[in-house]
C-alpha cells in the first residue's frame, strides 16, 4: 500500500506540476525597431521580438506579426506604447497628433477583428519644443480560444520609442475556461 | 486502504494549499511621503510602505527601497505614479516637464541595473493654472530570479502625490519557471 | 488497490479542476452609455454590462452599479477609462478639465468607502481642436474579502468614450488569503 | 551630408509661370519641414513658406498664398515652387532651404535666379 | 507676423573693434524655455550661413569672435574682435511663429 500511496504522490505530482506548467501559456512582445512603419496612420506592428531581453513566449506562438493563442482559456492581455520626439531627429507633419493605442483579436474560423482595448491621448506637441514623450497604458482580462491572434495597432508608428522598456505588449493565462 | 486514501487526500490537501501559497509572493507597495527627494532630477524612490492601509508583502522582502525576489518566477510588475502641483504650494521651477517613471531590476550577482518598463509625459504645466495633475500606469510580465531587486525610479519626485491610492507599485508571482 | 487508486486519482482531478476554477472568481465590466450621468462633478458609475461583448462575470455579483466580492482573496483590479470630445456635440463647458477616476471599495460591514487606486490628468481642451482624447489606466493588488464591493468613480461623465474596448474595468483572483 | 541642389536661371514673360526645383539628398526628405525664401536684388530675405513632403502638408506666408505653390516628389526627394502670374516683382533669387538640427537654416541650395521680362 | 527690426541698418567698425548689432522683435519670440532667434551672415552672390542659432548657441564651424544674447523681444549680435573677412550684410530671423519672418539686414563695413 505505501508502494502504491507513494506512486499516488508521485504520479500526482507529476501530473500537478506538468499540468499547472502547461496551464499557463505566456508572452512578452518588446518592438523590433528596425521596421517600424512611417506614416501617421492607424497601422497594425507586425515586428516584434519574442526571445531577446524581456521579450519571451511560451506555449504560445509568435507569427506574422500576431499573437497566436494555442490554449484556450481566460487571459490577461496588456500593452505598453511609448511614442516620442526629438527635434534633431526630423520636424513633425502636424503639431496636433491623436496617439492611439488598439488591442485587437482576430478570429480566423470567422475572419473578423474586434478591438478588445485602446487607449491613447490627442497632443499637441509644439515644434518649438526640444523633446516630447508620451506613454500609453492598457490591460484587461479576456476569453481566448485557441486560435486566435492578438495585434496592436498604433496611430503615427514614426514615433514609436524603439526600447525594449518602453514599446511591449503581452499576455499570460490566469485561468482555464469552465 | 480507506485510512491510507484519506492520508492520501489529506497530505494531498496540505501540499497543494500549502504548495500553492508558497508559489504565489505578492507585494504591493505604497509611498512613503514622509521621505520624498526634492528636485526634478531623476531620483530613485527609497521610502515605501509595506505593511499599512493598502500595502502589504508576502514572500518577498523590502530592503533598502528595493523589493527583493525571494522566489524564482513569473511575476507580473506594476507601477502607477501620480504627480501633482497646486498653486498654494509655491512656483514650478519650470513650466515645462518630463514626468516619468523607470521600474528598474538590479541583480546583484552581476551588479547591474536594467529598466524593465518606462512610461510618461512630457507636460506644459502653466503657471496660470491653479491645479495640474497627471498619473503613469505601467505593467508587464517579467522572469525574475532570486535576489533580484525591484526598485522605481522617477522625475521630478518633488511633485509626487503622496496618498497610497495615487502612487504605488507592485507584483505577484504568476507561475514557475520550467 | 488499483480501485481505491483510481478512485484517489477522479477524486484528486475533480477536487483539483472544481477547487481551481472555483478559486478564480473574475469580472471585466463594460460601461453601459445607455445611462451615463450628465453633468462634470465626480460621479460613481452605475451602468456596466457583465454579459455582452467582452463583459463576462463569474464567482462575482455586479448589483446596483457595483462589483461585490463573494470569495476572500487576493485579486489584481483594473480600469481603463477613456474620455472624448468631438465638436459636433457641442461646446465643452470649460477648456480646462480634470479627467480623473477613482476605483474604491465599500465595506459593508463597516460602512465605509476606501479609494483604492486613482489616476487621470488635468487637461487643456481648446475650443479650436476638433477632436480630443484621453485616456487613464490603473491596476493594483488588493486583498478583498467576501461582500466588499469595488465601485467606480469619474469626473466629466458626460465625456466617457461608451465604446466596450475603452471604457471598463475589472478584478480577476489570483491566491487565497493564507 | 546635407545638400541642397537648385535648378538653373529662369527667364520668364509677364503673366507666365515657372516651376523651380530643389533636389535633396543626405538626409531623410520625408522627414523635415523644406523651406523657400525669396531675395530681390540688393534687398533683404523674405520667408514664402514650406512643405512637409510626407504628407505634403503646406504653409505660407499670407503675401505668398496665391502666388507660390509648394509641392514634394518623395521618389525624388525634390521639393518644387511654382510661381505664377508673374510681374517683375517675382524677379528676385530664389532659395531652398532646411533647418538644422538644433533649429536655425543651416543648410541652404545654392539659389535660382528668376527673371522676369517682357 | 512678428516684425524683426534691426538696428543700425549700416555700420563701419575698425579691425580688432566690437561689432554690435541689435534685433527687436514686435512679440516674445521664447517658448517651451528658448529663443526662437537665429543670425545669419551673407555675403554677396551667396546663400545665407547661419551663425547663431536659438539666440545664443554657436553654431559648428563657426568663430568663437560671434556670440549672440538676448530674450523675448530684444536680441544682440557681437562680432569681437572684428575681422576682414566679417565684412558682410547680417540677418535675424524668428522661427517662434509662423509665417518665419527676417530682419532687414545690417550692412557691416571693416574700416
Known amino acids: 500500500i505505501r508502494a502504491e500511496k507513494a506512486m499516488v504522490d508521485g504520479s500526482w505530482l507529476d501530473l500537478a506540476k506538468r499540468s499547472k506548467l502547461e496551464a499557463q501559456p505566456f508572452a512578452h512582445l518588446t518592438i523590433n525597431a528596425t521596421n517600424i512603419p512611417t506614416g501617421s496612420h492607424k497601422v497594425s506592428l507586425s515586428s516584434w521580438y519574442h526571445d531577446r531581453g524581456w521579450a519571451k513566449i511560451s506555449n504560445m506562438t509568435f507569427s506574422n506579426g500576431k499573437l497566436i493563442v494555442n490554449q484556450d482559456g481566460f487571459y490577461y492581455l496588456y500593452a505598453n506604447i511609448c511614442f516620442r520626439h526629438h527635434e534633431t531627429s526630423g520636424d513633425l507633419a502636424t503639431e496636433y497628433l491623436q496617439l492611439m493605442v488598439y488591442v485587437t483579436k482576430t478570429s480566423i474560423k470567422i475572419p473578423s477583428s474586434h478591438t478588445l482595448m485602446k487607449g491613447g491621448s490627442t497632443k499637441y506637441w509644439s515644434g518649438n519644443s526640444e523633446f516630447h514623450f508620451y506613454s500609453i497604458n492598457v490591460g484587461g482580462f479576456f476569453k481566448l480560444r485557441s486560435g486566435e491572434e492578438i495585434s496592436v495597432e498604433v496611430s503615427n508608428p514614426s514615433l514609436l520609442d524603439p526600447d525594449q522598456d518602453a514599446t511591449y505588449f503581452g499576455a499570460f493565462k490566469v485561468r482555464d475556461i469552465d | 486502504i480507506r485510512a491510507e486514501k484519506a492520508m492520501v487526500d489529506g497530505s494531498w490537501l496540505d501540499l497543494a494549499k500549502r504548495s500553492k501559497l508558497e508559489a504565489q509572493p505578492f507585494a504591493h507597495l505604497t509611498i512613503n511621503a514622509t521621505n520624498i527627494p526634492t528636485g526634478s532630477h531623476k531620483v530613485s524612490l527609497s521610502s515605501w510602505y509595506h505593511d499599512r492601509g493598502w500595502a502589504k508583502i508576502s514572500n518577498m522582502t523590502f530592503s533598502n527601497g528595493k523589493l527583493i525576489v525571494n522566489q524564482d518566477g513569473f511575476y507580473y510588475l506594476y507601477a502607477n505614479i501620480c504627480f501633482r502641483h497646486h498653486e498654494t504650494s509655491g512656483d514650478l521651477a519650470t513650466e515645462y516637464l518630463q514626468l516619468m517613471v523607470y521600474v528598474t531590476k538590479t541583480s546583484i550577482k552581476i551588479p547591474s541595473s536594467h529598466t524593465l518598463m518606462k512610461g510618461g509625459s512630457t507636460k506644459y504645466w502653466s503657471g496660470n493654472s491653479e491645479f495640474h495633475f497627471y498619473s503613469i500606469n505601467v505593467g508587464g510580465f517579467f522572469k525574475l530570479r532570486s535576489g533580484e531587486e525591484i526598485s522605481v525610479e522617477v522625475s521630478n519626485p518633488s511633485l509626487l502625490d503622496p496618498d497610497q491610492d495615487a502612487t504605488y507599485f507592485g507584483a505577484f508571482k504568476v507561475r514557475d519557471i520550467d | 488497490i488499483r480501485a481505491e487508486k483510481a478512485m484517489v486519482d477522479g477524486s484528486w482531478l475533480d477536487l483539483a479542476k472544481r477547487s481551481k476554477l472555483e478559486a478564480q472568481p473574475f469580472a471585466h465590466l463594460t460601461i453601459n452609455a445607455t445611462n451615463i450621468p450628465t453633468g462634470s462633478h465626480k460621479v460613481s458609475l452605475s451602468s456596466w454590462y457583465h454579459d455582452r461583448g467582452w463583459a463576462k462575470i463569474s464567482n462575482m455579483t455586479f448589483s446596483n452599479g457595483k462589483l461585490i466580492v463573494n470569495q476572500d482573496g487576493f485579486y489584481y483590479l483594473y480600469a481603463n477609462i477613456c474620455f472624448r470630445h468631438h465638436e459636433t456635440s457641442g461646446d465643452l463647458a470649460t477648456e480646462y478639465l480634470q479627467l480623473m477616476v477613482y476605483v474604491t471599495k465599500t465595506s459593508i460591514k463597516i460602512p465605509s468607502s476606501h479609494t483604492l487606486m486613482k489616476g487621470g490628468s488635468t487637461k487643456y481642451w481648446s475650443g479650436n481642436s476638433e477632436f480630443h482624447f484621453y485616456s487613464i489606466n490603473v491596476g493594483g493588488f488588493f486583498k478583498l474579502r467576501s461582500g466588499e464591493e469595488i465601485s467606480v468613480e469619474v469626473s466629466n461623465p458626460s465625456l466617457l468614450d461608451p465604446d466596450q474596448d475603452a471604457t471598463y474595468f475589472g478584478a480577476f483572483k489570483v491566491r487565497d488569503i493564507d | 551630408q546635407v545638400q541642397l541642389q537648385q535648378s538653373g536661371a529662369e527667364l520668364a514673360s509677364p503673366g507666365a509661370s515657372v516651376k523651380l526645383s530643389c533636389k535633396t539628398s543626405g538626409y531623410t526628405f520625408t522627414t523635415y519641414w523644406l523651406q523657400w525664401v525669396k531675395q530681390r536684388p540688393g534687398q533683404g530675405l523674405e520667408w514664402i513658406g514650406a512643405?512637409?513632403?510626407?504628407?505634403?502638408?503646406?504653409k505660407y506666408t499670407q503675401k505668398f498664398k496665391d502666388k507660390a505653390t509648394l509641392t514634394a516628389d518623395k521618389s525624388a526627394s525634390t521639393a518644387y515652387m511654382q510661381l505664377s502670374s508673374l510681374t517683375s516683382e517675382d524677379s528676385a533669387v530664389y532659395y531652398c532651404?532646411?533647418?538644422?538640427?538644433?533649429?536655425?537654416?543651416?543648410?541652404w541650395g545654392q539659389g535660382t535666379l528668376v527673371t522676369v521680362s517682357a | 507676423n512678428i516684425v524683426l527690426t534691426q538696428s543700425p541698418a549700416s555700420l563701419a567698425v575698425s579691425l580688432g573693434q566690437r561689432a554690435t548689432i541689435s534685433c527687436r522683435a514686435s512679440?516674445?519670440?521664447?517658448?517651451?524655455?528658448?529663443?526662437?532667434m537665429h543670425w545669419y551672415q551673407q555675403r554677396p552672390g551667396q546663400p545665407p550661413t547661419l551663425l547663431i542659432y536659438?539666440?545664443?548657441n554657436l553654431e559648428s564651424g563657426v568663430p568663437a569672435r560671434f556670440s549672440g544674447s538676448g530674450s523675448r523681444t530684444d536680441f544682440t549680435l557681437t562680432i569681437d574682435p572684428v575681422e576682414a573677412d566679417d565684412a558682410a550684410t547680417y540677418y535675424c530671423q524668428q522661427d517662434n511663429e509662423d509665417p518665419y519672418t527676417f530682419g532687414g539686414g545690417t550692412k557691416l563695413e571693416i574700416k
Open positions: 536659438l539666440a545664443s
Open positions: 512679440e516674445s519670440v521664447d517658448s517651451y524655455g528658448r529663443s526662437f
Open positions: 512643405i512637409y513632403p510626407g504628407p505634403g502638408n503646406t
Open positions: 532651404a532646411r533647418r538644422g538640427s538644433r533649429r536655425g537654416i543651416a543648410y
